[in-house]
Interface confidence: medium
């Protein structure tokens, strides 16, 4: 009974629930993650335990520092939910659930170009499609390494399309597209497609 009273005697603001977090919330399979279990009370020696659903994963002690659990997310069921327990003597509190979002990375997109040539202009249609990767996918088109379109979000497995009209250029121009989904710091690019300068029959993409 004394242990229970000791725990009850601890005011909620003295020993609140711990916080479970990760710098990385959106992950791909096989990715390493660090989970941080922290507590507002920096003066107590706290024993932290990490759980996935009801499975106990590990325990460590700490004082003033967050507990750090290093995991690898290899299967879908390892996305969570995770929970952290902070314990001092017989008094324990649990964090809120934390779950990762598993996202398949985008594969390199394919860029297709269609051109309608007139005497003065080129009407260019760019199509970009990544056949693999979790939706939605954001596509951005580039000309000579400069973005020429806003991010175009596709919620289905359909190519993104971007139209532009250019005065018949005297120089070659290189186009490529970028595909990106919710995975942070993970973008893929298409192979560049070079549009030759005008002159003669040098427009392989043109519809005459």
């Amino acid at each position: 009974r004394k242990a229970v009273l000791d725990c009850e005697a601890m005011k909620t603001n003295e020993f609140p629930s711990p916080c479970l977090d990760s710098k990385t919330k959106v992950v791909m399979k096989g990715q390493n993650v660090s989970m941080f279990c922290s507590h507002k009370n920096k003066s107590l020696q706290i024993t932290y335990s990490l759980f996935r659903r009801k499975t106990h994963l590990g325990t460590q002690d700490g004082k003033g520092e967050p507990a750090i659990f290093n995991l690898s997310i290899t299967e879908a069921h390892e996305s969570g939910p995770y929970k952290c327990k902070a314990q001092v003597t017989s008094c324990s509190k649990y964090s809120r659930d934390f779950s990762f979002t598993i996202v398949d990375p985008v594969t390199s997109p394919v860029l297709n170009i269609m051109v309608i040539q007139t005497e003065t202009d080129r009407h260019i249609t760019l199509h970009c499609l990544s056949v693999n990767g979790s939706l939605p996918i954001n596509y951005t088109f580039f000309e000579n390494h400069v973005a020429i379109s806003p991010a175009i979000s596709k919620y289905d497995r359909e190519p993104a399309e971007f139209n532009l009209t250019k005065k018949n250029p005297g120089e070659e121009e290189e186009y490529r597209c970028e595909a990106k989904n919710r995975l942070p710091n993970y973008a893929t690019y298409s192979h560049p497609v070079t549009m030759p300068s005008t002159g003669g029959d040098s427009c392989p993409f043109c519809l005459k």
């Epitope: 390493n32 941080f36 020696q45 994963l57 967050p66 995991l71 690898s72």
Partner: antibody, heavy 121, light 111 residues
Framework: EVQLVESGGGLVQPGGSLRLSCAAS????????MSWVRQAPGKCLEWIGT???????YYASWAKGRFTISRDNSKNTVYLQMNSLRAEDTAVYYC???????????????WGQGTLVTVSS | DIQMTQSPSSLSASVGDRVTITCQAS??????LAWYQQKPGKAPKLLIY???TLESGVPSRFSGSGSGTDFTLTISSLQPEDFATYYC?????????????FGQGTKVEIK
């Protein structure tokens, strides 16, 4: 049964290099951080470094730059690469498993039998 | 880094004696301390962790106490198989570092 078996020790000349291996069995290496600890003849235990479950490495200040810990989870093996060896590196080298899962903040529940490294010309 | 200081460095005792070994950390480590026993030519064996928790299979004559900077390993009634060297070890981590530090050892010899 949990077992750790070190290998790769032997005689090496000053300035030379050596790679020690620690083969683990009876548990999945991917869930445990691992450390290397050494003991010079008649001396105390000395922590060299630790590799976490996500391959972050931590070293004693004297070991940084000369010693490198790595792991191959597919082979269930941990390695210690030692470069620019000196006579004072002569010791028995142990690999040790940290007890708690997924953390480097732990104690050593399992040790290998050790492998002797002698640095001498 | 934290330094661990053990005392005494050696002691002579008889079977049945009560033996106490102390370990002092250069700064507070809470209860992040373990005790090991090592016999000649063998690897260390874990006895106590979290300063006072007895490892499974270790005889109850071994006990640990202390927190902060001062720790004690006690053998309540020394047995012939207890003659060995004992080490304390602190373990510490933060988001940027992780390290272990051992004491210099206490050799328990037969009187």
């Amino acid at each position: 049964e949990v077992q750790l078996v070190e290998s790769g020790g032997g005689l090496v000349q000053p300035g030379g290099s050596l790679r020690l291996s620690c083969a683990a069995s009876g548990f999945s290496l991917s869930s445990h951080a691992m450390s290397w600890v050494r003991q010079a003849p008649g001396k105390c235990l000395e922590w060299i470094g630790t590799i976490s479950t996500i391959d972050t490495t931590y070293y004693a200040s004297w070991a940084k730059g000369r010693f490198t810990i790595s792991r191959d989870n597919s082979k269930n093996t941990v390695y210690l690469q030692m470069n620019s060896l000196r006579a004072e590196d002569t010791a028995v080298y142990y690999c040790a498993r940290l007890s708690e899962l997924y953390t480097t903040n732990s104690y050593y529940s399992r040790w290998g039998q050790g492998t002797l490294v002698t640095v001498s010309s | 880094d934290i330094q661990m200081t053990q005392s005494p460095s050696s002691l002579s005792a008889s079977v049945g004696d009560r033996v106490t070994i102390t370990c002092q950390a250069s700064e507070s480590i809470g209860s992040l301390l373990a005790w090991y026993q090592q016999k000649p030519g063998k690897a260390p064996k874990l006895l106590i962790y979290r300063a006072s928790t007895l490892e499974s299979g270790v005889p109850s004559r071994f006990s640990g106490s202390g927190s902060g900077t001062d720790f004690t390993l006690t053998i309540s009634s020394l047995q012939p198989e207890d003659f060995a060297t004992y080490y304390c070890q602190s373990y510490h981590y933060s988001s940027s570092s992780s390290y272990a530090a051992f004491g210099q050892g206490t050799k328990v010899e037969i009187k």
